[in-house]
């Protein structure tokens, strides 16, 4: 591994240790539960593909933050606290990715079934943009993908 990466990893590690990502987890869980309440829990109802054009932030310019204020109407208290925490990673895309991966890992046991997992992942992908932040590149949210041997 390269020197910058070792230094970067250490810096990121301490950032992750300082961060409180719980509000993000709570915000996302509340969101998918609200969605389930709205649409019902029928597993056979047509669910959107997690990468469908209307859902995937990459279909828009991936670097244009969400047009609405993160404290706008309807945004939960959890979301605001979550965005404040994620803001700490704005200048380190790799670390932003690790923070999002950590959120995914922390919640993976609580997600019931493939559909709920995909829904959570979809909301997680939208989270940086909701917070007015850039979404990371080269970031795999698959929990089962295992450790990464970078370069």
């Amino acid at each position: 591994r390269q020197q910058w990466e070792l230094q970067g990893d250490r810096r990121c590690q301490s950032q992750l240790e300082r961060a409180n990502l719980r509000p993000c987890e709570q915000h996302l869980m509340q969101k998918i539960q609200r969605d389930e309440d709205s649409y019902g829990r029928d597993p056979y109802s047509p669910s959107q593909d997690p990468y469908s054009p209307s859902q995937d932030p990459d279909r828009r310019d991936p670097y244009s933050p969400s047009p609405y204020d993160r404290r706008g109407a309807g945004s939960s208290q959890h979301q605001e606290r979550c965005c404040n925490e994620l803001n700490e990673f704005e200048n380190n895309q790799r670390c932003m990715c690790e923070a999002l991966q950590q959120i995914m890992e922390n919640q993976s046991d609580r997600l019931q079934g493939r559909q709920q997992e995909q829904q959570f992942k979809r909301e997680l992908r939208n989270l940086p943009q909701q917070c007015g932040l850039r979404a990371p590149q080269r970031c795999d949210l698959e929990v089962e993908s295992g450790g990464r041997d970078r370069y």
């Epitope: 990459d58 080269r138 795999d140 990464r148």
Partner: antibody, heavy 121, light 108 residues
Framework: QVQLVQSGPEVRKPGASVRVSCTTS????????MNWVRQAPGQGLEWMGL????????GYAQKFQDRVTMTSDTSLSTAYLELSGLTSEDTAVYYC??????????????WGQGSLVTVSS | SYVLTQPPSVSVAPGKTASITCEAK??????VHWYRQKPGQAPVVVVS???DRSSVIPERVSGSKSGDTATLTISRVEAGDEADYYC???????????FGGGTKVTVL
């Protein structure tokens, strides 16, 4: 519109080094990673590595790890590829390619016109 | 390391359908992108993110994947489709970009 303009052709002797530049316009340089891809005559595309101009972070393909250096100058919106210890096998067209996508989606919409590097004694 | 395998060449008569495959272990879990390269030119993305066709590419071109195979399909082939085609993925395990070896499409 997005433009990537590369430096001209180069001829080098075996053992020498070469530096190729890629000057960009039409977008915010630090917002996207720059990749380098090469293509030997009659061969396929080969990814060499990338640089994040915002952080200066680099990542190189295993094969080139020991002799490639990727840098960028944000004031000039320019990325550079330097390859040392050249052999005839390094004769190729070298392309810069700007990244696109988020999360697992990672591909190249914008490419430079290519720079031919010829290694010959 | 992750390897993408493409057939070196595919020949097709005008008006027929060309299918270019890209094989790799469990490619269905990867995001596959396709490029077209004409002689003396830089590659151009034709399909990104498995099946999202580039705006400059006609509807005759489409991408799909299943199991260990991703496929680029060109229907109603024209002379202008003659080119080299490459598949590409980002491999998260090694954090490397990987290209297939390329397929030369010849219109008979």
């Amino acid at each position: 519109q997005v433009q990537l303009v590369q430096s001209g052709p180069e001829v080098r002797k075996p053992g020498a080094s070469v530096r190729v530049s890629c000057t960009t316009s039409g977008y915010t340089f630090i917002d996207y990673e720059m990749n380098w891809v090469r293509q030997a005559p009659g061969q396929g595309l080969e990814w060499m590595g990338l640089i994040n101009p915002h952080s200066g972070d680099t990542g190189y393909a295993q094969k080139f790890q020991d002799r490639v250096t990727m840098t960028s100058d944000t004031s000039l919106s320019t990325a550079y590829l330097e390859l040392s210890g050249l052999t005839s096998e390094d004769t190729a067209v070298y392309y810069c390619a700007r990244s696109q996508g988020t999360f697992e989606v990672y591909y190249f919409v914008s490419w430079g016109q290519g720079s031919l590097v010829t290694v010959s004694s | 390391s992750y390897v993408l395998t493409q057939p070196p060449s595919v020949s097709v008569a005008p008006g027929k359908t060309a299918s270019i495959t890209c094989e790799a272990k469990n490619i269905v879990r990867k995001r596959v992108h396709w490029y077209r390269q004409k002689p003396g030119q830089a590659p151009v993305v034709v399909v990104s993110d498995d099946e999202d066709r580039s705006s400059v590419i006609p509807e005759r071109v489409s991408g799909s994947k299943s199991g260990d195979t991703a496929t680029l399909t060109i229907s109603r082939v024209e002379a202008g489709d003659e080119a080299d085609y490459y598949c590409q993925v980002w491999d998260s395990t090694t954090d490397q970009v990987v290209f297939g070896g390329g397929t030369k499409v010849t219109v008979l």
